[in-house]
């Protein structure tokens, strides 16, 4: 089930996801001066089965000033049977998704993609917040938000984060890392509530914010 709204806006903060639940959609947006190719996909979709999750569809951008000419590049050997690829396409998601079952990793970039991605999230998705440069975080609790289903409606929990412009000499702007421990989550709302909180993501979040051990390389 898609979340009705976007995650909450926190003044002077941005949010990011570590991984994307199956059902998530990513708009195929192009940077200024480029557009989606005719008959190209409007979005990518995170789909999966019991063994792995992957992004369906390809995003393709072409110059607004020219006809649909896409420069051909040679596919990687393992990709040649699957599809013909062009420089404007986003490569397929790797098959290995074992570390986050039911989730897709970050889709690889595509040529002339817009800088900011627009996702459409599903129930159970978690996003993490940080203050933008020049602001520092005052935490009252977890700096994260989860899309939940309550009484048949979706809503995002409110991240407990305030970003202030008052700089502390010992701190980089917004340097506090997202609170990733399951214990700190406000889960007091229980009536008529269906939640799908991913503690595995939170655990991995805590680890990867320190040092990255597992990486996925996109072919």
């Amino acid at each position: 089930e898609l979340c009705d709204d976007d995650p909450p806006e926190i003044p002077h903060a941005t949010f990011k996801a570590m991984a994307y639940k199956e059902g998530t959609m990513l708009n195929c947006e192009c940077k200024r001066g480029f557009r989606r190719i005719k008959s190209g996909s409007l979005y990518m979709l995170c789909t999966g089965n019991s063994s792995h999750s992957s992004w369906d569809n390809q995003c393709q951008c072409t110059s607004s000033a020219t006809r649909n000419t896409t420069k051909q590049v040679t596919p990687q050997p393992e990709e040649q049977k699957e599809r013909k690829t062009t420089e404007m396409q986003s490569p397929m998601q790797p098959v290995d998704q074992a570390s986050l079952p039911g989730h897709c990793r970050e889709p690889p970039p595509w040529e002339n993609e817009a800088t900011e991605r627009i996702y459409h999230f599903v129930v159970g998705q978690m996003v993490y917040y940080q203050c933008v440069q020049g602001y520092r975080a005052l935490h009252r609790g977890p700096a994260e938000s989860v899309c939940k289903m309550t009484h048949g409606k979706t809503r995002w929990t409110q991240p407990q984060l305030i970003c202030t412009g008052e700089m502390e000499t010992s701190q980089f702007p917004g340097e506090e890392k997202p609170q990733a421990s399951p214990e700190g989550r406000p889960e007091s709302e229980t009536s008529c509530l269906v939640t799908t909180t991913d503690f595995q993501i939170q655990t991995e979040m805590a680890a990867t914010m320190e040092t990255s051990i597992f990486t996925t390389e996109y072919q």
Epitope: P109, Q130, T215
Partner: nanobody, 125 residues
């Protein structure tokens, strides 16, 4: 003040390896995607590799895929580029770049808002 300082470049023989480092300061390194770009003499600056904010996902230019590995240590505010099986056409100035606040990857120059001063890599045949 945001600062990106590359190091580790040098003169090597074809087939050798090098490890570039980029020390970042003045911003929350663990929250940003990062990337490496390079500029060969007489050519435009080109994308080499990028890594997401978590350090879990990476993407490479076709010309370096399988030979180069990008990584980031969010605890030490450092970006790395491990380069192996170097070729003469890898010669150039290598730049570390910070992705903009809302950018998912440091894939194009438009995605980036801060750059290091660069480190020279020369691969002789």
């Amino acid at each position: 003040e945001v600062q990106l300082v590359e190091s580790g470049g040098g003169l090597v023989q074809a087939g050798d390896s090098l490890r570039l480092s980029c020390a970042a300061s003045g911003f929350n390194f663990g929250w940003h995607a990062m990337g490496w770009f390079r500029q060969a003499p007489g050519k435009e600056r080109e994308f080499v590799a990028t890594i997401t904010w978590t350090g879990r996902d990476t993407y490479y230019a076709d010309s370096v895929r399988g030979r180069f590995t990008i990584s980031k240590d969010n605890a030490k505010n450092t970006l790395f580029l491990q380069m192996s099986s170097l070729r003469p056409d890898d010669t150039g100035v290598y730049y570390c770049a910070k992705a903009r606040e809302r950018a998912t990857w440091a894939y194009s120059e438009d995605d980036c808002d801060y750059w290091g001063q660069g480190t020279q890599v020369t691969v002789s045949s």
